[in-house]
Interface confidence: low
């Protein structure tokens, strides 16, 4: 199974200190992964290569994303990407990419969270994306 | 074979201008790779996808890591990641990720070196990690 | 098929506002991919993991690379990496890595473009590279 996702939108719920991205498939092979709004549901357990990139346009001193999974009654951070941002708006433009290999369980929900309220993201599909490859 | 490693600690030997990371397995499939303190020994020769991320909080003007292999009587840099760091401690916060595909030989020792004495690293397992996927 | 490429040189054509990298193979397995000067030709259609890193030494406010494919009469950006750069030359030293999974067609030409005239790149093979893995 392979899944490459691109953004639909990004939102912060009222009074939330995080920004979440809603995803749609750009490339899909196999049925082991299913995009579900702000998350991706794992249908087939196994070892996956996960990758995530977010393109930030924000002068907040550090920006980044956290890729986590929720399942079996607990939440676990898998990996995160962190980028210090310039304070000048014209320079505050950075992509943040990270990836890793993890064992995912059937029913896990994978999500990308930016731990900032109303983070300023560039949602172009070649700047912000999320992907899975079953190994 | 698949191996995803996370840090145990990072040390600079006396009078050394480098910082090395000691690794422990977080995910292991197959017997082709073996964590050995500051290095990873290749048991099965072949083509591997290697990835490395280090999370820096250091005001040294540039930080980064070098992934190299030692074997057959020589040392070779495979890839490196470099990140310019802000001079203000509150902003000096960057992950540096890189990866590539390489042919590794049986007996090779792979290591991650930060070419700075006493580099200030974040050793959280979702910020600093190292991985191998045999292709 | 697997292909890991390193730079030969990088040039800006007269009056061009982009810098292109010319590539040579460092590791090759299979015949599905062929380096052709500034591009890589896809011989075998399929789903590929692509990765790209460029090492910048440039004080231009933001630097980065665009990985795109040209084929079937159109050009498409697959992904890009963007890095804000410090204004001080001694600090302006950043690698920019990104990757993703894409369906490539037979005859597609893949290229890495830096959308800056005469971009200052470090063409060491462990700092700037390009790779493909057929999944």
């Amino acid at each position: 199974s392979v899944l490459h996702l691109v953004p639909i939108n990004a939102t912060s719920k009222d009074d939330s200190d995080v920004t979440e991205v809603m995803w749609q498939p750009a490339l899909r092979r196999g049925r082991g992964l299913q995009a579900q709004g702000y998350g991706v549901r794992i249908q087939d357990a196994g070892v996956y290569l996960l990758y995530s990139q977010v393109l930030f346009q924000d002068v907040t001193f550090t920006m980044g994303q956290v890729v986590s999974r929720e399942g079996q009654g607990r939440q676990e951070t898998l990996f995160r990407c962190i980028r210090s941002m310039p304070s000048h708006p014209d320079r505050a433009y950075n992509s943040c990419y990270s990836a890793g290999v993890f064992h995912l369980h059937q029913g896990d929900i994978l999500s990308v969270i930016i731990p900032r309220a109303r983070a300023k993201l560039n949602l172009s599909p070649h700047g912000t994306f999320l992907g899975f490859v079953k190994l | 074979s698949v191996l995803h490693l996370v840090p145990i600690n990072a040390t600079s030997k006396d009078d050394s201008d480098v910082t090395e990371v000691m690794w422990q397995p977080a995910l292991r499939r197959g017997r082709g790779l073996q964590a050995q303190g500051y290095g990873v020994r290749i048991q099965d020769a072949g083509v591997y996808l290697l990835y490395s991320q280090v999370l820096f909080q250091d005001v040294t003007f540039t930080m980064g890591q070098v992934v190299s292999r030692e074997g057959q009587g020589r040392q070779e840099t495979l890839f490196r990641c470099i990140r310019s760091m802000p001079s203000h401690p509150d902003r000096a916060y960057n992950s540096c990720y890189s990866a590539g595909v390489f042919h590794l030989h049986q007996g090779d020792i792979l290591s991650v070196i930060i070419p700075r004495a006493r580099a200030k690293l974040n050793l959280s397992p979702h910020g600093t990690f190292l991985g191998f996927v045999k292709l | 098929s697997v292909l890991h490429l390193v730079p030969i040189n990088a040039t800006s054509k007269d009056d061009s506002d982009v810098t292109e990298v010319m590539w040579q193979p460092a590791l090759r397995r299979g015949r599905g991919l062929q380096a052709q000067g500034y591009g890589v030709r896809i011989q075998d259609a399929g789903v590929y993991l692509l990765y790209s890193q460029v090492l910048f030494q440039d004080v231009t406010f933001t630097m980065g690379q665009v990985v795109s494919r040209e084929g079937q009469g159109r050009q498409e950006t697959l992904f890009r990496c963007i890095r804000s750069m410090p204004s001080h030359p001694d600090r302006a030293y950043n690698s920019c890595y990104s990757a993703g999974v894409f369906h490539l067609h037979q005859g597609d030409i893949l290229s890495v473009i830096i959308p800056r005239a005469r971009a200052k790149l470090n063409l060491s093979p462990h700092g700037t590279f390009l790779g493909f893995v057929k999944l």
Partner: antibody, heavy 120, light 107 residues
Framework: EIQLQQSGPELVKPGASVKVSCKAS????????MYWVKQSHGKSLEWIGY????????GYNQKFKGKATLTVDKSSSTAFLHLNSLTSEDSAVYYC?????????????WGQGTSVTVSS | DIVMTQSQKFMSTSVGDRVSITCKAS??????VSWYQQKPGKSPKPLIY???NRFTGVPDRFTGSGSGTDFTLTINNVQSEDLADYFC?????????FGAGTKLELK
């Protein structure tokens, strides 16, 4: 300025429970783990455990498993230490401390401490 | 668990002296050791991390050294405000453990 402000002293009866709070300010609460440390009167320091405010993940010193429970409220940037089935052995000062995951790997800012006295 | 042994419970000194407080780990902890100063009724104040790095604002008369199993906190030119309890801590592996402390007092 980074600060950890702990709740006031507690006088509780044996068998009861107590909840100590630690409000963080001056930094991004979810960026660093929060540690809890016990100091009995005139004695050394004992590490109780940690909580990762980002995802609620915890790790405990085996000695305090079943005795201590760590939680956070991200909305108020507050960490909590809940101690149950209290005995005189639990009388101590309890500190919260931020673990700087990034620069130093150790506890760089400490709360002022909360005194818990267990007495009938 | 790793045991951190501070063999001197008390050390007597005079203002202007040089004093060395030692700490021994039961296992190799690399340089994952910090030192804290604590005054009565106050929380511990971090002095040294990674065995030899001073925290911001810590006077340079405080010096940490050592690696592996043997660590030393040295105070040069002792000042009256340095009279306090000193604890070492290892953060190489869980559970984190502290030494029993060394009380620095005036002769």
């Amino acid at each position: 300025e980074i600060q950890l402000q702990q709740s006031g002293p507690e006088l509780v009866k044996p068998g009861a429970s107590v909840k100590v709070s630690c409000k963080a300010s001056g930094y991004s609460f979810t960026d660093d783990n929060m540690y809890w440390v016990k100091q009995s009167h005139g004695k050394s320091l004992e590490w109780i455990g940690y909580i990762d405010p980002l995802n609620g993940g915890t790790g405990y010193n085996q000695k305090f498993k079943g005795k201590a429970t760590l939680t956070v409220d991200k909305s108020s940037s507050t960490a909590f230490l809940h101690l149950n089935s209290l005995t005189s052995e639990d009388s101590a000062v309890y500190y919260c401390a931020r673990r700087d995951n990034y620069a130093t790997g150790t506890m760089d800012y400490w709360g002022q401490g909360t005194s818990v006295t267990v007495s009938s | 668990d790793i045991v951190m042994t501070q063999s001197q419970k008390f050390m007597s000194t005079s203002v202007g002296d040089r004093v060395s407080i030692t700490c021994k780990a039961s296992k190799n902890v690399g340089t994952d050791v910090s030192w804290y100063q604590q005054k009565p009724g106050k929380s511990p104040k971090p002095l040294i991390y990674w065995a030899s790095n001073r925290f911001t604002g810590v006077p340079d008369r405080f010096t940490g050294s050592g690696s592996g199993t043997d660590f030393t906190l040295t105070i040069n030119n002792v000042q009256s405000e340095d009279l306090a309890d000193y604890f070492c801590e290892q953060y190489s592996s869980y559970p984190l453990t502290f030494g029993a402390g060394t009380k620095l007092e005036l002769k």
